[in-house]
Interface confidence: medium
C-alpha cells in the first residue's frame, strides 16, 4: 500500500509487512480465502528442576577406556564435541503467531503456524504447519513439538475468531448531511457465539483515531475524498480489516454574484450575474411584486435573463439562487436585487358621468384608472365646443364643476389621467346645455 499523507505534527511511515501479527492495511482480494492474524494465547509451562531439559548435553561426548600400569581399569570421560542444551519447546515457541485463513465456502478456518520448521502438533493433525477445519468461535488446543526442542511442549490455545462475512462495513451517512458528514458502522449481519465483549473496533480516518463500532465525521469539505481504515480485533488480535474511500456529496452551491439588475423599459427588466464557484445544476430566478411571486428555472449556462411582460412603474424584488440535485436537492444562498420598471401611459379613467347642475353648469366625475403606471396622480378635463377648446382644467381628483357654459350648445367632455410622465387615453362624453329657463 502506498504511504498515507502525514497529518500535521506527525509523520506516518508504511514499512514492509513482517510475517508476524496481522496489521496489514487492506483485505486481500480476488480469492475466496482471506488471511487474518492473531498470536495465539499462551498456556506457558515452566520446566521443573531435574527434568530432561538439559539431558542431551553429553550426547556427543565419547567414553574411552585405558589400562593403567597397575592394571586397574580407569574410566575417563573425554569430551570430543559438546552441543549446547536444547531449549524447551515451550520456550522456543513462546511467541509463536498464527494467521487465520478463512474459507468462505466451508465457513471454516485454517490456522497457519508462523514457524520456520515443520512442527508436530500432538493429537491434532497439522500438515505443513497448518491446523485445518477450525470452527469459528471455538477454542482448539494444539501441543507443539519438534526435534530441535525438548519437553515440555508448547501448548497453544487457538482462539478462533468469528467468520469474516458476519461483519459488514456499512455507510450510515444521512443523505441530507452527506455533503459535510461521513458515518461508518460495522454491522453484525449474522449471529455468532464468540463473546462480543472480546471484539473491539478501530477506525483511523486521516489523523482522527476512533475506538468505536460506529464513527461520525463532521464539518467535512463537500466533494472531497476521505479514506478511512478500519479493523476488527478479537481478543486484541486483528482478524479483519477494511478500507473505505468515501467522497462527500456535492455541497450547497455558493451565492451567485449579481452584476446588475435594472428596468430597461416599462414592461421589461434585465438581470446579469456571475455563477457561483461550486458545482451546481441550474438556477432558480424568482421575482416578486407586492405579494405576487413568480419563479423560473434557468439553464446553468445562463448569465443574463430578460424579464418580459412586467407591470410598469412597479417595484420588483428579484432573488437568484443556484441549486444542485445530489443525494438530495441542495439550494445555494440567494442573491437579491430590485428595480422599479419605467413609467408607461396610464389606462383610461372609467365610469365617467356628466350631469347638469344648472342651465349653464355641468358636473363631471370619473373613477381612477385601473393602472396608473407612473409616479403622480392628476386628472385633466378638456371641454370642446365644435373644434374649439373652451376649458382645460386639472384636479387631484376626478371631480370637475364646469360653470358659465353657453346655453343650448353641444359640448365634448374629455377626461383623462396623467401620471406625471404620460397622459392616459381620454374618456369622451357629449352633453348639451339647455335653453335658458329664464
Amino acid at each position: 500500500q502506498s504511504p498515507t499523507p502525514s497529518p500535521t505534527g506527525v509523520s506516518s511511515v508504511q514499512t514492509p509487512h513482517l510475517p508476524t501479527h496481522a496489521d496489514s492495511q487492506t483485505p486481500s482480494a480476488g480469492t475466496d480465502t482471506q488471511t487474518f492474524s492473531g498470536s495465539a494465547a499462551n498456556a506457558k509451562l515452566n520446566p521443573t528442576p531435574g527434568s530432561n531439559a538439559i539431558s542431551d548435553a553429553y550426547l556427543n561426548a565419547s567414553e574411552t577406556t585405558t589400562l593403567s600400569p597397575s592394571g586397574s581399569a580407569v574410566i575417563s570421560t573425554t569430551t570430543i564435541a559438546t552441543t549446547p542444551s536444547k531449549p524447551t519447546c515451550d520456550e522456543k515457541y513462546a511467541n509463536i503467531t498464527v494467521d487465520y485463513l478463512y474459507n468462505k465456502e466451508t465457513k471454516l478456518f485454517t490456522a497457519k503456524l508462523n514457524v520456520n520448521e515443520n512442527v508436530e502438533c500432538g493429537n491434532n493433525t497439522c500438515t505443513n504447519n497448518e491446523v485445518h477445519n477450525l470452527t469459528e468461535c471455538k477454542n482448539a488446543s494444539v501441543s507443539i513439538s519438534h526435534n530441535s526442542c525438548t519437553a515440555p511442549d508448547k501448548t497453544l490455545i487457538l482462539d478462533v475468531p468469528p467468520g469474516v462475512e458476519k461483519f459488514q462495513l456499512h455507510d450510515c451517512t444521512q443523505v441530507e448531511k452527506a455533503d459535510t458528514t461521513i458515518c461508518l458502522k460495522w454491522k453484525n449481519i449474522e449471529t455468532f457465539t464468540c463473546d462480543t465483549q472480546n471484539i473491539t473496533y478501530r477506525f483511523q480516518c486521516g489523523n482522527m483515531i476512533f475506538d468505536n463500532k460506529e464513527i461520525k465525521l463532521e464539518n467535512l469539505e463537500p466533494e472531497h475524498e476521505y479514506k478511512c481504515d478500519s479493523e476488527i480485533l478479537y481478543n486484541n488480535h486483528k482478524f479483519t480489516n477494511a478500507s473505505k474511500i468515501i467522497k462527500t456529496d456535492f455541497g450547497s452551491p455558493g451565492e451567485p454574484q449579481i452584476i446588475f439588475c435594472r428596468s430597461e423599459a416599462a414592461h421589461q427588466g434585465v438581470i446579469t450575474w456571475n455563477p457561483p464557484q461550486r458545482s451546481f445544476h441550474n438556477f432558480t430566478l424568482c421575482y416578486i411584486k407586492e405579494t405576487e411571486k413568480d419563479c423560473l428555472n434557468l439553464d446553468k449556462n445562463l448569465i443574463k435573463y430578460d424579464l418580459q411582460n412586467l407591470k410598469p412603474y412597479t417595484k420588483y424584488v428579484l432573488s437568484l439562487h443556484a441549486y444542485i440535485i445530489a443525494k438530495v436537492q441542495r439550494n445555494g444562498s440567494a442573491a437579491m436585487c430590485h428595480f422599479t420598471t419605467k413609467s408607461a401611459p396610464p389606462s383610461q379613467v372609467w365610469n365617467m358621468t356628466v350631469s347638469m347642475t344648472s342651465d349653464n353648469s355641468m358636473h363631471v366625475k370619473c373613477r381612477p384608472p385601473r393602472d396608473r403606471n407612473g409616479p403622480h396622480e392628476r386628472y385633466h378635463l378638456e371641454v370642446e365646443a365644435g373644434n374649439t377648446l373652451v376649458r382645460n382644467e386639472s384636479h387631484k381628483n376626478c371631480d370637475f364643476r364646469v360653470k358659465d357654459l353657453q346655453y343650448s350648445t353641444d359640448y365634448t367632455f374629455k377626461a383623462y389621467f396623467h401620471n406625471g410622465d404620460y397622459p392616459g387615453e381620454p374618456f369622451i362624453l357629449h352633453h348639451s346645455t339647455s335653453y335658458n329657463s329664464k
Epitope: S12, L18, H21, A22, Q25, S39, N42, N95, I209, D211
Partner: antibody, heavy 119, light 107 residues
Framework: QVHLVESGGGLVKPGGSLRLSCAAS????????MTWIRQAPGKGLEWVSY????????YYADSVKGRFTISRDNAKNSLFLQMNSLRAEDTAVYYC????????????WGQGTLVTVSS | EIVMTQSPATLSVSPGERATLSCRAS??????LAWSQQKPGQAPRLLIY???TRATGIPARFSGSGSGTEFTLTISSLQSEDFAVYYC?????????FGGGTKVEIK
C-alpha cells in the same frame, strides 16, 4: 505482571547518536501497540513515536521526524528507538509505554532512561 | 495540533479535602481524553480514560467528567499518596498531545 525496562540512555554530544531499548515482560508483547514518550527535565510529557503490532504502521512527532527511528523485535519482546542527529532539545527522560487494548492511551509505562545531549 | 491547557498549574489542598483539576482542548476531542498521575522520580500511571472511565485498580475517589473541549478530574478526598503531578492527554488526533500538568501539593 506487566514490566517495561528502558536502557541505552546516557550523555552524548550534539549531532551524535544513541539507541534506546525497552525490554517487555509479563504480557504478550506482539499483541500490543507500543510508543515512546519523553519528558524534558522539569517539563511536561511529549509523545515521540508509535508503532503497530508488526511495525507496518509507524508515527513520529514532527520534532523528531527524519532523525529518530522506532522498531520492534517481537521474538525478543523488545522495542527500540534509534536516535540520530541529536540536539540539546532532545535532552529528556525517555519512557516506553504500552498502548491500552481498546483505546489509544497508555496503560503501562517503564521507569525511563535519561538522555543528555550536551557538548 | 491540538493544544491541551491545564489549570491551575499548582493546586494547594489539605489532606481529606476535594481537589478539582481542569483541562481544556483547543478543539473538540469528543471523550477521547485520559488522565495520568506522576510522582517525583516515577513513571506516569494511567488513572482515567474515555474522559470518565477509571483504569484497573484506581480508587473510586478519582473521577473524570467532561466531553468536547472541557474536562475535569476530581479527587473527592485527598490522601497523602495523591500529592503528585496530573497530566491530561488527548487521543482523538495525531499527534497525541499532553497538557502541561497540574501539581497538587500539600497546603
Amino acid at each position: 505482571q506487566v514490566h517495561l525496562v528502558e536502557s541505552g540512555g546516557g550523555l552524548v554530544k550534539p549531532g551524535g547518536s544513541l539507541r534506546l531499548s525497552c525490554a517487555a515482560s509479563g504480557f504478550t508483547f506482539i499483541n500490543y501497540y507500543m510508543t515512546w514518550i519523553r519528558q524534558a527535565p522539569g517539563k511536561g510529557l511529549e509523545w515521540v513515536s508509535y508503532i503497530s503490532l508488526s511495525g507496518s504502521t509507524i508515527y513520529y512527532a514532527d520534532s523528531v521526524k527524519g532523525r529518530f527511528t522506532i522498531s520492534r523485535d517481537n521474538a525478543k519482546n523488545s522495542l527500540f528507538l534509534q536516535m540520530n542527529s541529536l540536539r540539546a532539545e532532545d535532552t529528556a527522560v525517555y519512557y516506553c509505554a504500552r498502548r491500552a487494548a481498546t483505546v489509544t492511551t497508555f496503560d503501562y509505562w517503564g521507569q525511563g532512561t535519561l538522555v543528555t545531549v550536551s557538548s | 495540533e491540538i493544544v491541551m491547557t491545564q489549570s491551575p498549574a499548582t493546586l494547594s489542598v489539605s489532606p481529606g479535602e476535594r481537589a478539582t483539576l481542569s483541562c481544556r482542548a483547543s478543539q473538540s476531542v469528543r471523550s477521547n481524553l485520559a488522565w495520568s498521575q506522576q510522582k517525583p522520580g516515577q513513571a506516569p500511571r494511567l488513572l482515567i480514560y474515555g474522559a470518565s472511565t477509571r483504569a484497573t485498580g484506581i480508587p473510586a475517589r478519582f473521577s473524570g467528567s467532561g466531553s468536547g473541549t472541557e474536562f475535569t478530574l476530581t479527587i473527592s478526598s485527598l490522601q497523602s499518596e495523591d500529592f503528585a503531578v496530573y497530566y491530561c492527554q488527548q487521543y482523538n488526533n495525531w499527534p497525541l498531545t499532553f497538557g502541561g500538568g497540574t501539581k497538587v501539593e500539600i497546603k
